[in-house]
Structure formats: structure tokens, C-alpha cells
């Protein structure tokens, strides 16, 4: 008789999850000399240990501590780019501006980027058919807790001027319920971070509004100011031109506003 299996509302573990994590770790440590000391088998064992045989709605940040320890990494604290609901452009930007880093440019962020995973209570099986959805099932699931943990650490490490890319096409440009709004904003350290600079990315070709005046941006400014961090905001009216100008700053068309 087949064992009853919990059916969750979200997609199951990404195909070849163990092989992918291990392969990404090997690749990352080959490319980044400062991480060559990392033992990828130990990294996978720690990752696996965080969720295997545990109920996928009862995962805690403590479960991920062994993995966090193994993945400890120093990135230039003044070169951090946070993002909310605009991952593609943020990654396109750091692919061009190689000295800036999103969370997914770090080892732990890269290991888990685009992946889903969960286990089952009291069995060593990985569930490839379904995993808990943050809204419909539970928030303390393996994926959400992982990103909450690494995002908090990433924000805590930031210093000087921290940039954040926000999606100007969304109804809530700044969303208090996003990882940026609920975790990263509250873990920037006022004694290290001087300014949070928001880049509001416009979606429409003819959109010339000043989205820095949006009520949700004003709300972000208020939260940041109360934490004794300065706030600044820039409209990026033409994201395509913005990236071109990052690539070729000497281009004559790059002196005008983008």
C-alpha cells in the first residue's frame, strides 16, 4: 500500500536538486578564488540537513545555521544591490557592472537561485511533486526560511551607500511584505549604512512621471529615516538605455537623464 503523501499547493522540488546544488557549488568555488577553500560536499550535507526529515512547515533559521557558517563570504559592503520584484534587471545590471553584487551573486544565493525544495517529516525523501506555498500553506517552509535567513545576513553586511532596484510598474512599488520590505530594510545597520538609494525602474516607454513621489516610496523613506539612514531616490525612465550606459558610459547619449 503506497504511503500517503502530503499534497502541498506549491510546485515540488526542482528536478535534480541535489546534483544542481553540488554542481553550482563546485562551479562557484572554481570561479571565485576567495571561496576555493569551501568543501562542496559539506555544503550539500549542511543544506540537506536543514530540511530533510523535517516537517516542511516547521523550518527555522537555526536549521540553516550550519549552512550559513560554511557559506560565510565577504563581499565589498559598499557595493551591494538589493532588489524587489525586478530580479531580471538587477541580475542584468550586475552582469555588466561586475563590481556590484546582488544576493544571487554570492555563493549561498547562487546555490538556491530559481530553485524550490522541501522534504517530508520523518523520511529522508525529497518531495519532487509539491512543496508548501508561502500564502496557501505556511510561511515557515524551507525555501522562504532560507531566503529570509540569507537576506537578513546580506543586509546586515551592507555599508556606506546601499542601492535597491524597485519595480515602478507594480501597484506597490515598495511592498512592506516583500523580502526587501520585511527583512532587508529592517536589517540595514544604521552605524554602517549612510544612505539607501532607490532606483525606481519605469516600465512604460512614455512614462515620464516622477515615481519617487509615489506614496509607497514615501513610506519607504519614512521607515529608513526613522532608522537614522538617509534616503535618496532616482527614476530610471529607460532601463534599456540605463544598461547600455552602464556598459558604455562614454556614449554621447549617456549624459542625458535615463
Amino acid at each position: 500500500v503506497p504511503r500517503w503523501r502530503q499534497q502541498w499547493s506549491g510546485p515540488g522540488t526542482t528536478k535534480r536538486f541535489p546534483e544542481t546544488v553540488l554542481a553550482r557549488c563546485v562551479k562557484y568555488t572554481e570561479i571565485h578564488p576567495e571561496m576555493r577553500h569551501v568543501d562542496c560536499q559539506s555544503v550539500w550535507d549542511a543544506f540537506k540537513g536543514a530540511f530533510i526529515s523535517k516537517h516542511p512547515c516547521n523550518i527555522t533559521e537555526e536549521d540553516y545555521q550550519p549552512l550559513m557558517k560554511l557559506g560565510t563570504q565577504t563581499v565589498p559592503c559598499n557595493k551591494i544591490l538589493l532588489w524587489s520584484r525586478i530580479k531580471d534587471l538587477a541580475h542584468q545590471f550586475t552582469q555588466v557592472q561586475r563590481d556590484m553584487f546582488t544576493l544571487e551573486d554570492t555563493l549561498l544565493g547562487y546555490l538556491a537561485d530559481d530553485l524550490t525544495w522541501c522534504g517530508e517529516f520523518n523520511t529522508s525523501k525529497i518531495n519532487y511533486q509539491s512543496c508548501p506555498d508561502w500564502r496557501k500553506d505556511c510561511s515557515n517552509n524551507p525555501v522562504s526560511v532560507f531566503w529570509k535567513t540569507v537576506s537578513r545576513r546580506f543586509a546586515e553586511a551592507a555599508c556606506d551607500v546601499v542601492h535597491v532596484m524597485l519595480n515602478g510598474s507594480r501597484s506597490k512599488i515598495f511592498d512592506k511584505n516583500s523580502t526587501f520590505g520585511s527583512v532587508e530594510v529592517h536589517n540595514l545597520q544604521p552605524e554602517k549604512v549612510q544612505t539607501l538609494e532607490a532606483w525606481v525602474i519605469h516600465g512604460g516607454r512614455e512614462d515620464s512621471r516622477d515615481l519617487c513621489q509615489d506614496p509607497t516610496i514615501k513610506e519607504l523613506e519614512s521607515i529608513i529615516s526613522k532608522r537614522n539612514i538617509q534616503f535618496s531616490c532616482k527614476n530610471i525612465y529607460r532601463p534599456d538605455k540605463f544598461l547600455q550606459c552602464v556598459k558604455n558610459p562614454e556614449d554621447s547619449s549617456c549624459t542625458s537623464e535615463i
Partner: antibody
């Protein structure tokens, strides 16, 4: 959600070139290989080649070697496939499809495509 | 002549089981993973099975895959009219250093 959106239909004359694009969204573009697969009218699937957007390394099917060029632009999350010296038997629907994680591809010959574009119809006719 | 061969067509009644074979050689199926795709009329193919017998999230348990030696098989149980489509196997060919597909099998649900 993960999506691949291809450029519109093309009509070309024999001997001309065509450049088809495939824009990726909803995932980190540089983490996965992208394949091109074509399907002539009423025929089966035929693999054309693959590109690793991180670095741009390519592998082509023998029959397309020297006539096909695949490139990627990480600033727009787009891959391109150019076919030169077009012949009437190049008339087909050209699909782009996401392949395996490119870190995995360093170790294994995985060959499966989990997300497909809608296809671009290329017609070669005099 | 395709490197990997499939029967051109198979048919069965609703609720029945059908199998589709895919035959190759040691340079492709014999030493590499096989995947299976479903292509409904006028649409792009969809991944049904990867790594010989694994189902992606969201693919019903009615679809199964297996491999033995240089042959692979796709099984579909509890046939539905919506399963009418072309089915393709795919694998890597180490000798050609290229991806290969079978010629495709048209499934008719009677």
C-alpha cells in the same frame, strides 16, 4: 513565471540570412543553457544547437555547422540564432527551449528542455 | 534515417494503457538520459519525463518512463481524449556530440 518569448514570423528568399531572437524572463538567464530546435511543416523535432549564456559557448548539430550562429546578450536576457545561406528546406518553426542548469552541464550530458518558446515561423521562398 | 526510432503511430481507447517505444544505440540511449515530450496540435512541445523515469512537478502520475539497454518506453495509463498528441523521445548522442530526437509518435485516442 518562467517564460521564453520569441520574435515574429519571417519570410526570406533563398540565400538570405535570418536572425531569430528569444527573450527569457522569470529566472536568472545566465544559469541555464538555451537550445534551439526546429520543426519543418508536418515533420518531427530537429535539434539545431545550444548556447550557454554565461560566456556564450555553443554546440551545433553537425549539419548546421558553419551556417548557424548563436549569440547571447546578458543585458537583455536574450539569445539569438542567425541562419545564413537559407534554403527552402530551412522553412520551419524554430523553437528556443531552456535546457539544464549550466553548472550541471559541466558534469553531465543532460538533454531535456523544461520551458519552450512559442516558436518563430521562418518561411524561405523565392 | 533517424538515429533514434519511434513507431509512427499508436492508438488505444479511453481509459486504456498505451506504451510508446524509442530505440537507439549505445552512443545515445544506452549511455545517456532519455526525456519525453508531448506536442499538442499547433503548440510547443512540453516536457513529460526526464532522466528516463522522472516526472516534472505538475505532470500527472499517469505518465511514466523506463529505460532498458538501448531502448526507452513511455507509458500512459487511463488514456484521455486530451492525450491525443505527438510524442517525442530525446537524448544526447555522445558520438555525434549532439542532441537527437526520435521521429515522433502520433497517439490517437479512439
Amino acid at each position: 513565471q518562467v517564460q521564453l518569448v520569441e520574435s515574429g514570423a519571417e519570410v526570406k528568399k533563398p540565400g538570405a540570412s535570418v536572425k531569430v531572437s528569444c527573450r527569457a524572463s522569470g529566472y536568472t538567464f545566465t544559469n541555464y543553457h538555451l537550445h534551439w530546435v526546429r520543426q519543418a511543416p508536418g515533420q518531427g523535432l530537429e535539434w539545431v544547437g545550444t548556447i550557454n549564456p554565461r560566456g556564450g559557448s555553443t554546440t551545433y548539430a553537425q549539419k548546421f555547422q558553419g551556417r548557424v550562429a548563436m549569440t547571447s546578450d546578458t543585458s537583455t536576457s536574450t539569445v539569438y540564432m542567425e541562419v545564413n545561406r537559407l534554403r527552402s528546406d530551412d522553412t520551419a518553426v524554430y523553437f528556443c527551449a531552456r535546457g539544464s542548469d549550466n553548472a550541471l552541464a559541466d558534469f553531465y550530458n543532460y538533454y531535456d528542455m523544461d520551458v519552450w518558446g512559442q516558436g518563430t515561423t521562418v518561411t524561405v521562398s523565392s | 534515417q533517424a538515429v533514434v526510432t519511434q513507431p509512427p503511430s499508436v492508438s488505444a481507447a479511453p481509459g486504456q494503457k498505451v506504451t510508446i517505444s524509442c530505440s537507439g544505440s549505445s552512443s545515445n540511449i544506452g549511455n545517456n538520459y532519455v526525456s519525453w515530450y508531448q506536442q499538442l496540435p499547433g503548440t510547443a512541445p512540453k516536457l513529460l519525463i526526464y532522466d528516463n523515469n522522472e516526472r516534472p512537478s505538475g505532470i500527472p502520475g499517469r505518465f511514466s518512463g523506463s529505460k532498458s539497454g538501448t531502448s526507452a518506453t513511455l507509458g500512459i495509463t487511463g488514456l484521455q481524449t486530451g492525450d491525443e498528441a505527438d510524442y517525442y523521445c530525446g537524448t544526447w548522442d555522445s558520438s555525434l556530440s549532439a542532441g537527437v530526437f526520435g521521429g515522433g509518435t502520433k497517439l490517437t485516442v479512439l
